[in-house]
Amino acid sequence: DAEFRHDSGYEVHHQKLVFFAEDVGSNKGAIIGLMVGGVVIA
C-alpha cells in the first residue's frame, strides 16, 4: 500500500547563533562563548 500524504513529523526551529568575546580583565584573558536562543552553551 502507498503512504497517504502527510508532512514530515518534526518541526524545524530556526534560532540565531551569536558568537561573542568578553574582556574580563587585563591579566585574565577573555571568555569566548556561543549563545543559542539566548542561552550561553559554551
Epitope: 503512504e3 497517504f4 500524504r5 502527510h6 513529523g9 518534526y10
Partner: antibody
Framework: QVTLKESGPALVKPTQTLTLTCTLS??????????VGWIRQPPGKALEWLAH???????SYNPSLKSRLTISKDTSKNQVVLTMTNMDPVDTATYYC???????????????WGQGTTVTVSA | DVVMTQSPLSLPVTPGEPASISCRSS???????????LEWYLQKPGQSPQLLIY???NRFSGVPDRFSGSGSGTDFTLKISRVEAEDVGVYYC?????????FGQGTKLEIK
C-alpha cells in the same frame, strides 16, 4: 465558523454518473495544506473512504473505486466535486465530505464533516 | 488494504462505568514520518461522524477528558473513564497512514 455542505441528486438510475458537490465555508481550499475528502456510508453499514484532494491539486483515490471516481476542485467557488460513473444499487449510501489539513500546526485528521447527502440508486 | 478490526461490536454500559474498545490493524500503520495516523470517530444517532482522537492519543478540541486513546504498532484502544448517556453511538477507528484509508466496522455503545 467552519462548515461543509454536500449537495447532489437524491436518486440516480443504474449506469448513470453521480455528481456531488461539497461547498466549503469558514475556510479556503487555497490555503496551503488544506484538503477535502469524500467518505460514504451504505445504510446500516460502516464508513468507506473514497478520495481526497489537496490545495495544490494533488489527489488520492481508493484503488477499488479509482476507475469510477474523479475528484476536482473549484477554488473560486470554494467547492470540491466528486463524480462517480456507472452507478449501481450497491452504491446507495450517505455521502459525506470532510476536511483534513496538512501542517505541523494542524491536527491532520478529519476535523470537520458535512451533514451528508443520501443517494439512492434505483431504476 | 489495511483491515481495521474492532472489538466488541456491541458494548452495553451502565452510566458512570468505564468502557473500552479495541482496534487492531492488519499491518503497521506507522508512517515514514514517524507519526501513527490512528483516529477515533463517534457517530451519534442520526448525525455525521465527529472526531474524538487523532494520532493515537490526542484529544480533539472540545472532547471531554474522560475519553483517552492509547496504543502502538497494530494494537490500539479507546477508553471512556465514566460513560455518560450522551456517549451513545457508533465508534469507529480509522487509519490515515496507508492508501486506501480504512475504517473499522464500528462498535455500537448503548446504555444499559
Amino acid at each position: 465558523q467552519v462548515t461543509l455542505k454536500e449537495s447532489g441528486p437524491a436518486l440516480v438510475k443504474p449506469t448513470q454518473t453521480l455528481t456531488l458537490t461539497c461547498t466549503l465555508s469558514g475556510f479556503s481550499l487555497s490555503t496551503s495544506g488544506m484538503g477535502v475528502g469524500w467518505i460514504r456510508q451504505p445504510p446500516g453499514k460502516a464508513l468507506e473512504w473514497l478520495a481526497h484532494i489537496w490545495w495544490d491539486d494533488d489527489k488520492s483515490y481508493n484503488p477499488s473505486l479509482k476507475s469510477r471516481l474523479t475528484i476536482s476542485k473549484d477554488t473560486s467557488k470554494n467547492q470540491v466535486v466528486l463524480t462517480m460513473t456507472n452507478m449501481d444499487p450497491v452504491d446507495t449510501a450517505t455521502y459525506y465530505c470532510a476536511r483534513r489539513q496538512l501542517g505541523l500546526r494542524s491536527i491532520d485528521a478529519m476535523d470537520y464533516w458535512g451533514q451528508g447527502t443520501t443517494v439512492t440508486v434505483s431504476a | 488494504d489495511v483491515v481495521m478490526t474492532q472489538s466488541p461490536l456491541s458494548l452495553p454500559v451502565t452510566p458512570g462505568e468505564p468502557a473500552s474498545i479495541s482496534c487492531r490493524s492488519s499491518q503497521s500503520i506507522l508512517h515514514s514520518n514517524g507519526n501513527t495516523y490512528l483516529e477515533w470517530y463517534l457517530q451519534k444517532p442520526g448525525q455525521s461522524p465527529q472526531l474524538l482522537i487523532y494520532k493515537v492519543s490526542n484529544r480533539f478540541s472540545g472532547v471531554p477528558d474522560r475519553f483517552s486513546g492509547s496504543g502502538s504498532g497494530t494494537d490500539f484502544t479507546l477508553k471512556i473513564s465514566r460513560v455518560e448517556a450522551e456517549d451513545v453511538g457508533v465508534y469507529y477507528c480509522f487509519q490515515g497512514s496507508l492508501v486506501p484509508l480504512t475504517f473499522g466496522q464500528g462498535t455500537k455503545l448503548e446504555i444499559k
